[in-house]
């Protein structure tokens, strides 16, 4: 059974992940982002179901494509800290949160999503899990 300290650690990790995803979304939605229209043409894949930490496997699998799209937006008006580091940090958190005991084959929804929809989906996921822990 999860201890209060492990629950607290999970909560902090989720909050960190949430902040990183929100930072990316804010950068993309920034009215000064000249690349928004182009960035919205890239397709991302969403999980059919995302209700447990193990479902973060579906986020992990889309981090590389996310990094590639973010690389396109590194302009003066779009300030993200080094994309590679940011995605790497997210990846570390995701790996810790989902655990490595069970390898889940992610089931994806049929419809694709824009980068904004994709980020919003995972932000909602983090908020939802955090609310169950508090």
């Amino acid at each position: 059974a999860p201890t209060s300290s492990s629950t607290k650690k999970t909560q902090l990790q989720l909050e960190h992940l949430l902040l990183d995803l929100q930072m990316i979304l804010n950068g993309i939605n920034n009215y000064k982002n000249p690349k928004l229209t182009r960035m919205l043409t890239f397709k991302f894949y969403m999980p059919k179901k995302a209700t447990e930490l193990r479902h973060l496997q579906c986020l992990e699998e889309e981090l590389k494509p996310l990094e590639e799209v973010l690389n396109l937006a590194q302009s003066k008006s779009f300030h993200l800290r080094d994309t590679k580091d940011l995605i790497s940090n997210i990846n570390v958190i995701v790996l810790e949160l989902k655990g490595s005991e069970t390898t889940l084959m992610c089931e994806y929804a049929d419809e694709t999503a824009t980068i904004v929809e994709f980020l919003n989906r995972w932000i909602t996921f983090c908020q939802s899990i955090i609310s169950t822990l508090t």
Epitope: P34, R38, T41, Y45, E62, E68, S75, M105, C106, T112
Partner: antibody, heavy 121, light 113 residues
Framework: QVQLVQSGAEVKKPGSSVKVSCKAS????????IHWVRQAPGQGLEWMGW????????AYAQKFQGRVTLTADTSTSTAYMELSSLRSEDTAVYYC??????????????WGQGTLVTVSS | DIVMTQSPDSLAVSLGERATINCKSS????????????LAWYQQKPGQPPKLLIY???TGQSGVPDRFSGSGSGTDFTLTISSLQAEDVAVYYC?????????FGAGTKVEIK
């Protein structure tokens, strides 16, 4: 039709810089990324980096970071690759290339004819 | 960086016979979301730039003869020339287009036996 025409061969001294041009035609240069790939004599292909001519955003291979500069002039539909601190192992054919789609990792469907840069004292 | 390993280094095949080139990547090139493998094949003839033959492991580039086909998934891929023609003499390269930096195999030289 899509065409990428590069500048002519160059002979350079070690320590100097070279600037290769790549003029795009048959499409709007701001619609796609331009990549640079080099090939040493008798060797394989090595990706150097890309530029988005629309806003000058670039990505470089770690190996060339700090030594290569990619720029573009949209008024002349020309992209440039400048490589500094040249050494003999930089002797290669340098290609500009354009992908099939506006995507940093799409494969390269269109290539320039190549520019041979020889570094020799 | 993803390492691409090609085999064999060179290959001599009789005209009209099948030529098979292998390519192995150091990590999977399969994106589960769309079930696509991000691998391309190029042909390069002496003094010419490379020419894109196949991308997404098996999608033929427009104008490429259908004797060229690609297969494989994950980390193991194959380019097949079903019936070798004289004009197919060239060096063939695989390339992953999954992540930056895109990386190439060392090439396979195809000759006529």
């Amino acid at each position: 039709q899509v065409q990428l025409v590069q500048s002519g061969a160059e002979v350079k001294k070690p320590g100097s810089s070279v600037k290769v041009s790549c003029k795009a035609s048959g499409y709007s240069i701001t619609d796609y990324l331009i990549h640079w790939v080099r090939q040493a004599p008798g060797q394989g292909l090595e990706w150097m980096g890309w530029i988005d001519p629309e806003d000058g955003v670039t990505a470089y291979a770690q190996k060339f970071q700090g030594r290569v500069t990619l720029t573009a002039d949209t008024s002349t539909s020309t992209a440039y690759m400048e490589l500094s601190s040249l050494r003999s192992e930089d002797t290669a054919v340098y290609y500009c290339a354009r992908s099939l789609d506006y995507d940093p990792i799409y494969p390269f469907a269109y290539w320039g004819q190549g520019t041979l840069v020889t570094v020799s004292s | 960086d993803i390492v691409m390993t090609q085999s064999p280094d060179s290959l001599a095949v009789s005209l009209g016979e099948r030529a098979t080139i292998n390519c192995k990547s150091s990590q999977s090139l399969l994106r589960n979301g769309n079930q696509k493998n991000y691998l391309a094949w190029y042909q390069q003839k002496p003094g010419q730039p490379p020419k894109l033959l196949i991308y997404y492991a098996s999608t033929g580039q427009s104008g490429v003869p259908d004797r060229f086909s690609g297969s494989g998934s994950g980390t193991d891929f194959t380019l097949t020339i079903s019936s070798l023609q004289a004009e197919d003499v060239a060096v063939y390269y695989c390339q992953q287009h999954y992540v930056t930096p895109p990386t190439f195999g060392a090439g396979t030289k195809v000759e006529i036996k």
